[in-house]
């Protein structure tokens, strides 16, 4: 291995192989007691009034004063060591018998206490002047986050002690904070990149990397900012962090350029009623710029001239639109585009759609409404409406006809079929006023009613009637 | 533009030894690591070590008790010392960017011989 | 100390893809490894092509690129010039130390 390794495996190892601390006997072995019973202590020794680690009267603060200082042992201070390399350190301390009370040694990190699932020893060497006690940690295949200053506490007759920092650096590959990040860009128009990675060791330098050949003959010191001064086509790019242990490579990340979006594609009639069309379509690639509004196109496939187009403007979202004020019957041709930041895409192809039949747009004309006494019904004729074509096939009427008198409202209708222009239905109500209206019924619906014609219904009597308010051209009002 | 610029004594007699001094432009030599790679004549590659950039070393486990690689930052010089040489050390000796090997520098010549 | 094997010489025509080869006696070589490509012309001229992560240095044409191929590192020249004919070295770094192959030799006709 290098020398830096080397250093790593020896160096470490003598902080167990060398000599202990303070003035024990070497035939002394000593007792051993893990972190999780960490206040563990030795067994007393006899001839002593007060063994070490043990409860003891409390010593008075003059007393106290008096006891020599006691403090941890120096120790390495600064250990460097790979990634996934095994660690082991120690703290040590000489408690002179003259102290009456102490507690187990706590290993703490960066200022908080390391407890649970941490690999520490502690050993204890007594002696005829008191007792080395040596608090042993061991860390298995170090990561980034073992970084960080280790220390040892502990309580001498109730003072708390501290020993130096230790401080592990574990070294490694960059590591990236911050990576490139995909970005879709107009063309020929600069836009930045961000690469960030850390070590230790430092420092961390960057290469640029663009479609597989390096940007920068020069590293740049992470954090690094690549300025791109545009581009023309799609590009991948990636960042390369290099430092003494290796180089690590970020994601690459596409480039792509805003470019106008693709035609959509499956335009749909959902929907057809006479006077409207409900189209869908599936956008097209939105040429890495979101879709900003789409425009719908119309027009009459029936026009054997070019006829105009009518445009229909809408959102890009959702991909539905109900085109309104058409003709009834009527055949049109549709297609749709749709825009980005960029431009407009082409059309997507036309397709063929039909309006339905609309319902009939006049009333019946010269309505007349006469009296049969002695059938006791009503007479009611009228002339067919002139329906045009997109009105749709004439299938029937709907006659209207309400009756009132003093304390009595009665609403009737009947649809009658298309043969003639005439019905009969029976009188409901004497000593009434009866109020006729009729409208045209075609497949595509019922259309607007005529004026109403009112007649008086008497007790048995003579009869008053009044014709349609919507006589044919050159009749009068009276019968 | 990086470049690299070695230079050496030529001719070394058998058991001396041997430094060369490689200039760094366009680039601080805390920003790269620098290796140390030869050929012997009518040979191919072989590499001797590299500085890191944070001063560390690493070596040709091979040649390692012969050779001490230094730099002076300030400077931007890296050095190359090879002690006891022998006539099968007689090539021409490169310094290079380390990560990638793509900056060279044109190479001095060392012949070992009395 | 590991030992990096590739073709003696390889010969090729204008415009052809060649490519070249560099295999570790360790075991399959891995992004770890870094394997770097070297041309070699004469006068000692040495020229980095292919680094680090298989990027092209700076100002080394896109016919040159680096990939791993099985349990190689591999360098092709797509559509070969007859300026490329070169001795070409691969390297390859084991933790701590970079092994050179021996070098290819590569004629184009």
């Known amino acids: 291995g290098g020398t830096a390794e080397k250093w790593e495996e020896t160096e470490l190892d003598q902080l167990f192989s060398g000599p202990l601390p303070g003035r024990l006997p070497v035939n002394h072995r000593p007792f051993s007691a893990p972190h999780s019973s960490r206040d563990q202590l030795p067994p007393p020794q006899t001839g002593r009034s007060h063994p070490a680690h043990t409860a003891a009267p409390q010593v008075t603060s003059t007393a106290s004063k008096l006891l020599p200082p006691v403090a941890f042992n120096h120790t390495i201070g600064h250990i460097v060591l790979s990634e996934h390399k095994n660690v082991k350190f120690n703290c040590s301390i000489n408690i002179p018998n003259t102290y009456q009370e102490t507690a187990g040694i706590s290993w703490w990190k960066d200022g908080k206490e390391l407890l649970g699932a941490h690999h520490s020893i502690t050993q204890f060497y007594p002696d005829e002047e008191g007792v080395s006690i040596i608090a042993l940690f061991s860390i298995a295949s170090v990561q980034r986050s073992d970084n960080g200053s280790y220390f040892c506490k502990m309580k001498v007759n109730n003072r708390e002690i501290v020993s130096d920092p230790i401080y592990v650096e574990v070294q490694g590959l960059p590591y990236f904070i911050k990576q490139p990040e995909s970005v879709n860009v107009t063309r020929n128009t600069a836009f930045n990149l961000t690469c960030q990675a850390v070590g230790p060791p430092e420092p961390v330098n960057i290469f640029w990397v663009q479609n597989s050949s390096r940007v920068n003959e020069k590293p740049e010191r992470s954090p690094s900012v690549l300025t791109v001064p545009g581009l023309t086509e799609t590009a991948v790019f990636s960042c390369e962090a290099h430092n003494d242990k290796g180089l690590t490579v970020s994601k690459g990340v596409h480039i792509n350029i805003k470019v106008i979006p693709s035609p959509p594609t499956e335009v749909h009639i959902l929907n057809s009623t006479a006077h409207s069309i409900l189209v869908s379509w599936v956008p097209g690639f939105d040429g890495y710029s979101p879709l900003q509004n789409c425009s719908i196109q119309v027009k009459e496939a029936d026009r054997l001239s070019n006829g105009s187009v009518m445009v229909f403007n809408t959102s890009a979202s959702p991909h539905l639109y109900e085109i309104q004020q058409l003709q009834a019957l009527a055949n049109y041709s549709i297609a749709v585009s749709c825009r980005n930041e960029i431009g407009w895409s082409a059309v997507s192809p036309w397709i063929l759609a039909s309006t339905t039949e609309g319902a009939p747009s006049v009333a019946p004309l010269n309505i007349t409404v006469f009296l049969n006494e002695s059938n006791n019904i009503l007479d009611i004729r009228w002339t067919k409406p002139p329906i045009k074509r997109q009105d749709g096939e004439l299938v029937g009427y709907r006659i209207s006809h309400v009756w009132e008198s003093a304390g009595t409202y009665k609403e009737l209708s009947e649809e009658v079929s298309q043969n003639g222009s005439w019905a009969q239905i029976p009188v409901q109500i004497h000593n009434a006023t009866c109020t006729v209206r009729i409208a045209a019924i075609t497949k595509g619906g019922i259309g607007p009613f005529s004026e109403p014609v009112n007649i008086i219904i008497p007790e048995h009597s003579k009869v008053d009637y009044a014709p349609s308010s919507t006589p044919a051209p050159g009749n009068t009002d009276s019968m | 533009q990086v470049q690299l610029k070695e230079s050496g004594p030529g001719l070394v007699a058998p058991s001396q030894s041997l430094s060369i001094t490689c200039t760094v432009s366009?680039?601080?030599?805390?920003?790269?690591?620098i290796s140390w790679v030869r050929q012997p004549p009518g040979k191919g590659l072989e590499w001797l070590g590299v500085?890191?950039?944070?001063?560390?070393?690493d070596y040709n486990s091979a040649l390692k008790s012969r050779l001490t690689i230094s730099k002076d930052t300030s400077k931007n010089q890296v050095f190359l010392k090879m002690n006891s040489l022998q006539t099968d050390d007689t090539a021409r000796y490169y310094c290079?960017?380390?990560?990638?090997?793509?900056?060279w520098g044109t190479g001095t010549t060392v012949t070992v011989s009395s | 100390q590991a030992v990096v094997t590739q073709e003696s010489a390889l010969t090729t025509s204008p415009g052809e893809t060649v490519t070249l080869t560099c295999r570790s006696s360790?075991?399959?070589?891995?992004?770890?490894?870094?394997a770097n490509w070297v041309q070699e012309k004469p006068d000692h001229l040495f020229t980095g092509l292919i680094g680090?992560?298989?990027s092209r240095a700076p100002g080394i044409p896109a016919r040159f690129s680096g990939s791993l191929i099985g349990d190689k590192a591999a360098l092709t020249i797509t559509g070969a010039q007859t300026e490329d004919e070169a001795i070409y070295f691969c390297?390859?770094?084991?933790?701590?130390?970079?092994?050179f192959g021996g070098g290819t030799k590569l004629t184009v006709l």
């Open positions: 680090g992560a298989n």
């Open positions: 500085i890191w950039t944070g001063g560390g070393t």
């Open positions: 366009g680039i601080s030599l805390s920003s790269f690591a």
């Open positions: 390297a390859l770094w084991f933790s701590n130390h970079w092994v």
């Open positions: 360790t075991g399959a070589v891995s992004t770890s490894n870094y």
């Open positions: 290079a960017s380390h990560w990638y090997l793509d900056v």
